[in-house]
């Protein structure tokens, strides 16, 4: 469940974040899953752990494998797994599917292409951008912070876009590339007041004390690419991150799923080891865009353990 796929190219930097979240003050230990051998934290090593991050500087094909991270706090431990695959560099221009990050869609109004995973790295502008291996030139293309903006998008702009940047670690520079497909939507999209599909308003969710529980907040916002749309959970009117209960975390589901042509977003609230006090909270699923905000509230109730008949 708490496993994340990561991939990179040999001789490039790769930085992987532990899929389990924790406060910055918590210690995070990393291990090779197969051998249970601890990964060093000394930066002189080619592969080393740095808090929530595992750094391959640079990566080698032999680094491929599953890595375990354990987030340790005074009261609990949480385990996550990073499934890392390092590929040999391609000699030709084609980027295979297994190296592609999620596809993004653009339209005349909104044509931002974000450079995937860049936030994990210590990089400085400008980014270099390539389309189908050709360096992008011309005033229509603008590299801005961590994304590329294309002016006056046309259907011909569809294709595979690669961002290239330099990661700096203690004065040493490492190259990083990441590729994603960009599709252009012809049809005119539109935006609606958010519609929450789940949970139902004032839903009561049955949970078992001591077990884990998941709540999904799912909402649709219109058709086509949405300029500003978000779903999130709040506890008693407080952001999850500010609530300060590490057992309760929210995690993005599908980024933008187009079911029936509608643009929808999911956010999953994971409650580990449900406690009595969790039953007293109000769980607000909030969906918002430029039109406004809609709220559906969920409460938890204790599921009575099934009585066996003799």
């Amino acid at each position: 469940k708490f496993s994340k796929q990561s991939w990179g190219l040999e001789n490039e930097a790769l930085i992987v974040r532990c899929p389990r979240q924790g406060k910055p003050s918590y210690t995070v230990d990393w291990y090779y899953s197969q051998t249970n051998k601890s990964i060093p934290t000394q930066e002189r090593n080619r592969v080393f752990a740095s808090g929530q991050l595992l750094k391959f500087l640079p990566a080698a094909v032999a680094d491929s494998g599953i890595y375990t991270c354990i987030v340790r706090s005074p009261t609990f431990n949480r385990t996550g797994y990073a499934n890392v695959t390092i590929y040999k560099k391609q000699s030709d221009c084609n980027v295979p599917d297994y190296l592609m990050y999620s596809t993004v869609s653009g339209s005349e109004k909104n044509s931002k292409i974000y450079c995937p995973t860049i936030d994990l790295y210590n990089w400085t502008a400008p980014l270099e951008w390539f389309k189908n291996c050709q360096a992008l030139q011309g005033s229509r293309y603008r590299a801005h912070k961590s994304f590329l903006v294309i002016d006056n998008v046309m259907t011909e702009d569809a294709g595979d876009y690669t961002c290239k940047f330099i990661h700096n670690e203690n004065g040493a520079n490492y190259s990083v590339t990441a590729t994603r497909s960009f599709t252009v939507k012809d049809e005119q999209g539109f935006s609606l007041f958010p519609v929450i599909g789940a949970p139902a308003q004032n839903e009561i969710k049955e949970v078992e004390i001591g077990k884990n529980a998941n709540l999904t907040c799912s909402a649709c916002f219109g058709k086509g690419t949405q300029f500003l749309a978000a779903v999130l959970w709040q506890l008693n009117g407080t952001k999850i991150t500010d609530f300060g209960e590490p057992r309760i975390q929210q995690e993005e589901g599908q980024n933008q799923s187009f079911s029936n042509g509608l643009a929808c977003l999911d956010m999953v609230l994971r409650i580990a080891d449900v406690k009595e006090e969790d039953l007293l909270l109000q769980y607000d699923c909030l969906a918002l865009n430029l039109h406004g905000l809609r709220r559906h509230t969920v409460r938890l109730s204790r599921k009575n353990p099934s009585k066996e008949c003799f």
Partner: nanobody, 118 residues
């Protein structure tokens, strides 16, 4: 509400609203206005838990809604005012499970007059 008055086009005003009777969490609060002989028009709203803000198209980029939890006060900063912004401005609260500039509020204040002359 307070802060209303007369101002020349292009000028600014800041409206304030004391909201001590309102539960400040999980609440939608906003401003609406009514010009003589016209229908009530939503101006701006804020969802107090998180400070998410929403505006009518006619005021986007000119008006800013904000809250001060410590002072239990709601504000509307109005810049680049136009004659069509003239009207009585009402501070409002409690819109149920929706929040937008056009929310239907359950309670509102006495109103403060804003007059913009060209």
């Amino acid at each position: 509400e307070s802060g209303g008055g007369s101002v020349q086009a292009g000028g600014s005003l800041r409206l304030s609203c004391a909201t001590s009777g309102v539960t400040y969490r999980r609440t939608c609060m906003g401003w609406f206005r009514q010009a003589p002989g016209k229908e009530r028009e939503g101006v701006a709203a804020i969802y107090t838990s998180g400070g998410f803000t929403f505006y009518a198209d006619s005021v986007k980029g000119r008006f800013t809604i904000s809250q001060d939890n410590a002072k239990n006060t709601l504000y509307l900063q109005m810049n680049t005012l136009k004659p069509e912004d003239t009207g009585i401005y009402y501070c409002a609260a409690e819109a149920g499970d929706e929040c937008s500039a056009s929310s239907v509020f359950r309670s509102w204040g006495q109103g403060t007059q804003v007059t913009v002359s060209s």
